[in-house]
Every structure is written in structure tokens, then in C-alpha cells.
């Protein structure tokens, strides 16, 4: 039996700059029941506070609802582990909510096979920004990637589309079924997870419908 090992704050992420969650890795418990508490202060302020919500985001996490989330403030976050034999504190993590955004994936992915005047066939991929994103006001600007592969292929082919919410994919094989997904990243944040997979079959005898 021994004091607990040093916990490590794994990551903090926000879906929208309005709320955020931090997760930690506990470290060893020293063979004893161990309690974990997350405390935080804001840079330039004296007060230290305890995590407002240990439940919403699951085990070893702290959820900061709107009420507890400030942008343009640096949070200094630590996790403390305590058992009968002693305690241990993580290294502090400095968090600026503006820089930890991991949005929801883009939505309304649509796939359409089209043809140019020269009869060249292409797949037109279109999507919309994630619901929470207020793109027009500049609160968020998103960059996007799409990935696609034929059902038989092992590797995805990735296309960066910048801020465009549509993309044309050329050189596809007729008769093949293709899977497509999109993801997005805000200016200062992280890529979202890949969104829901959509599929489409490229017709063998594609002719443009009027």
C-alpha cells in the first residue's frame, strides 16, 4: 500500500467555445480507495475552485457548463489524487478555451454523380457546417477534409477543401461503390471526428438526366 501515483490531465476539449470538458488518467491507486478532485483557477485571479460537474462527461472527467466557461481567460487546471497514505497532484494544464475546440462533424453530407460537358463523370460532394457553428458571424470559420474509398480499397483518399463546403472528385471507377466522410476544424482547434459515412455507386452506363 502506498500513496497514489501522479495523475495526468489527458486533454480538455470544447465543442463550441461555450462549454468544455477535461479528462484525466488516474495513475496507480496505491492499492487503496483513491479520491480524485479537479481544481482550477483563472490566470490573474486569486480564487481556486473545484470542478463543477464530475458526472456529465463520464469517469475521470470534469464538465464546465456555460456558466463556468469563459473565453479570453486562461484556466490553470490540476487534478489531485488522495488516499489514506497520502496525495499526489498532476502537473498543471493551462487551457484557453479558444484553442481547444473540437467541433461536431459536418452535417447533411450529400453525394451526387454528375457529368461535365465533355462527358467526364465526377462525384459532387456537398455538406453543411456543424449545427453549433455560427460561421457567418466569424465566431467560427471551419476548414474541411473529405475522405473516400471504394468498398474494396484498404486506404482512404483524403482531400482538403479549405473553407469550401463542396468538392468534385474525378477519376472514379464505374460500377464501384464509394464510401465518403467529412470532418472539420476551426481556426485554432482540433479536427472533429469523421462524420457519418455515406455511400454511392458510380453507374456503369452513366448518362446525364435532363
Amino acid at each position: 500500500q502506498s500513496p497514489p501515483g501522479k495523475p495526468e490531465i489527458h486533454k480538455c476539449r470544447s465543442p463550441d467555445k461555450e462549454t468544455f470538458t477535461c479528462w484525466w488518467n488516474p495513475g496507480s491507486d496505491g492499492g487503496l480507495p483513491t479520491n480524485y478532485s479537479l481544481t482550477y483557477s483563472k490566470e490573474g485571479e486569486k480564487n481556486t475552485y473545484e470542478c463543477p460537474d464530475y458526472k456529465t462527461s463520464g469517469p475521470n472527467s470534469c464538465f464546465f457548463s456555460k456558466q463556468y466557461t469563459s473565453i479570453w481567460k486562461i484556466y490553470i487546471i490540476t487534478v489531485n489524487a488522495t488516499n489514506e497514505m497520502g496525495s499526489s497532484t498532476s502537473d498543471p494544464l493551462y487551457v484557453d478555451v479558444t484553442y481547444i475546440v473540437e467541433p461536431e462533424p459536418p452535417r447533411n453530407l450529400t453525394l451526387e454523380v454528375k457529368q461535365l460537358k465533355d462527358k467526364k463523370t465526377y462525384l459532387w460532394v456537398k455538406w453543411l457546417p456543424p449545427t453549433i457553428t455560427d460561421v457567418k458571424t466569424g465566431w467560427f470559420t471551419m476548414e474541411y477534409e473529405i475522405r473516400l474509398k471504394s468498398e474494396e480499397a484498404d486506404e482512404w483518399e483524403i482531400h482538403f477543401t479549405g473553407h469550401q463546403t463542396q468538392f468534385k472528385v474525378f477519376d472514379l471507377y464505374p460500377g464501384q461503390k464509394y464510401l465518403v466522410q467529412t470532418r472539420c476544424k476551426p481556426d485554432h482547434g482540433y479536427w472533429s471526428r469523421w462524420g457519418q459515412e455515406k455511400s454511392i455507386e458510380i453507374p456503369n452506363d452513366f448518362t446525364l438526366k435532363d
Epitope: V135, E145, F160, H163
Partner: antibody
């Protein structure tokens, strides 16, 4: 005919700012990205950033992010690149270029270039 | 950031020669490579994008190939107007970066 016409040469002192304009014609301005690239005397090409006029989305080379601002005026189909806190090594020809309508990063039409000289 | 390395940095050749310029990316960029030609005092001109697609109005003596990390630009039969500096550029994801250039001179 697609054309990108840039503003004239500028001479600036160190620490000053410069704003270069790029007026587009011959295509739908909001459908294509506008890139900014610079070339120091006798040197290669260096990408500064791009803007998508459709939603004002921008992407920057980290090297310029704190000093460069890209904007557009859709009513006049004009893109702008402002560079602040100028240093002598910012002396270069600055180009605007249109991004291909599908692939973001390749540049199919270029402005004639604007020479910016930074000297005390 | 993805680094682009061109070789050679300069090259002397004669009219009618077949010339190859290579470009290597520091990581996989799939087929996201463009080639530009630049003459003194002029802006660059797009020759090839997506590694092998010729831009509009570019003569067929120019061709591009490669994918992943290794790419080439080939001029099958040099013409007097082809003497210029050539740049490769990846257009895979930001930041887009250029090679250092290859100056093609008359022998």
C-alpha cells in the same frame, strides 16, 4: 477573361504597415479562393495565406499569422492583404492568385505583382 | 509543415532536349502537386496540377507524373520559350509550400 489587377508599388519604413489590393474580374469572385504569395529579390515563392470570399474563411502560413490580415470586399470583387510591423526582409513582390475552383491550393491565375520596399 | 525539395537547382539544356525536373515532398501528399513556370519580372504560370493534369492552354510537351512523395515534370522537346525557372508546390493542406526552384538555362 479572368484578370487580377493589383495596386501599385509601395515604399514603407520599418514598423509601418502596407495594404495591397487585388481587383478580380471575369469570373464569379465568391466562388474561388484568393491566395497571397510573396517573392523576395532573387528568391523563391513563399505562401502567405488564402481567403475564401464566400464566407471570409482564411488560412495562414503560421509565419505570417500574427502580422498579416486577409480581407475581401465582395461588392467590388477586391481582395486585400495587410502586413503590419514591416521589416527590411519583407521587401518583396507580393502576388495575389486565384485558387482553382475545386482544389484549394493550386493557383491558376495571378496578379501582376506589387513591389513593396521596406527601407529606413 | 511539408517541405518540398527540387532537383536540380539549375540545369543547362539545348533546344530540342528532353528535360526532367524532380520534386520530393517530406511526407505523403498523394497527387496534390502543382508545377509553375516563372520568367523574370513576371508572375508564375500554372503548368500542371494534381501531379499530372495540364492546366488550360499549356502545350502538350509538358507532362507531370508521380504520387506520394516523388514527382517529376518533363519537357519532351525544349522550345526557346521554355527557358525559365520552374517551381513545384504541394496543394495538399495548409500551409501550402513551394520548392526552391529549378533554373533552366540555355546551354
Amino acid at each position: 477573361e479572368v484578370q487580377l489587377v493589383q495596386s501599385g508599388a509601395e515604399v514603407k519604413k520599418p514598423g509601418a504597415s502596407v495594404k495591397v489590393s487585388c481587383k478580380a474580374s471575369g469570373y464569379t469572385f465568391t466562388d474561388y479562393n484568393i491566395h497571397w504569395v510573396r517573392q523576395a529579390p532573387g528568391q523563391g515563392l513563399e505562401w502567405i495565406g488564402y481567403i475564401y470570399p464566400n464566407n471570409d474563411g482564411t488560412g495562414y502560413n503560421q509565419k505570417f499569422k500574427s502580422r498579416a490580415t486577409l480581407t475581401v470586399d465582395n461588392s467590388t470583387s477586391t481582395a486585400y492583404m495587410e502586413l503590419r510591423s514591416l521589416r527590411s526582409d519583407d521587401t518583396a513582390v507580393y502576388y495575389c492568385a486565384r485558387g482553382d475552383g475545386n482544389y484549394v491550393g493550386d493557383m491558376d491565375y495571378w496578379g501582376q505583382g506589387t513591389t513593396v520596399t521596406v527601407s529606413s | 509543415d511539408i517541405q518540398m525539395t527540387q532537383s536540380p537547382s539549375s540545369l543547362s539544356a539545348s533546344v530540342g532536349d528532353r528535360v526532367t525536373i524532380t520534386c520530393r515532398a517530406s511526407e505523403n501528399i498523394y497527387s496534390y502537386l502543382a508545377w509553375y513556370q516563372q520568367k523574370p519580372g513576371k508572375p508564375p504560370k500554372l503548368l500542371v496540377y494534381n501531379a499530372k493534369t495540364l492546366a488550360e492552354g499549356v502545350p502538350s510537351r509538358f507532362s507531370g507524373s508521380g504520387s506520394g512523395t516523388d514527382f517529376t515534370l518533363t519537357i519532351s522537346s525544349l522550345q526557346p520559350e521554355d527557358f525559365a525557372t520552374y517551381y513545384c508546390q504541394h496543394h495538399y493542406a495548409t500551409p501550402f509550400t513551394f520548392g526552391q526552384g529549378t533554373k533552366l538555362e540555355i546551354k
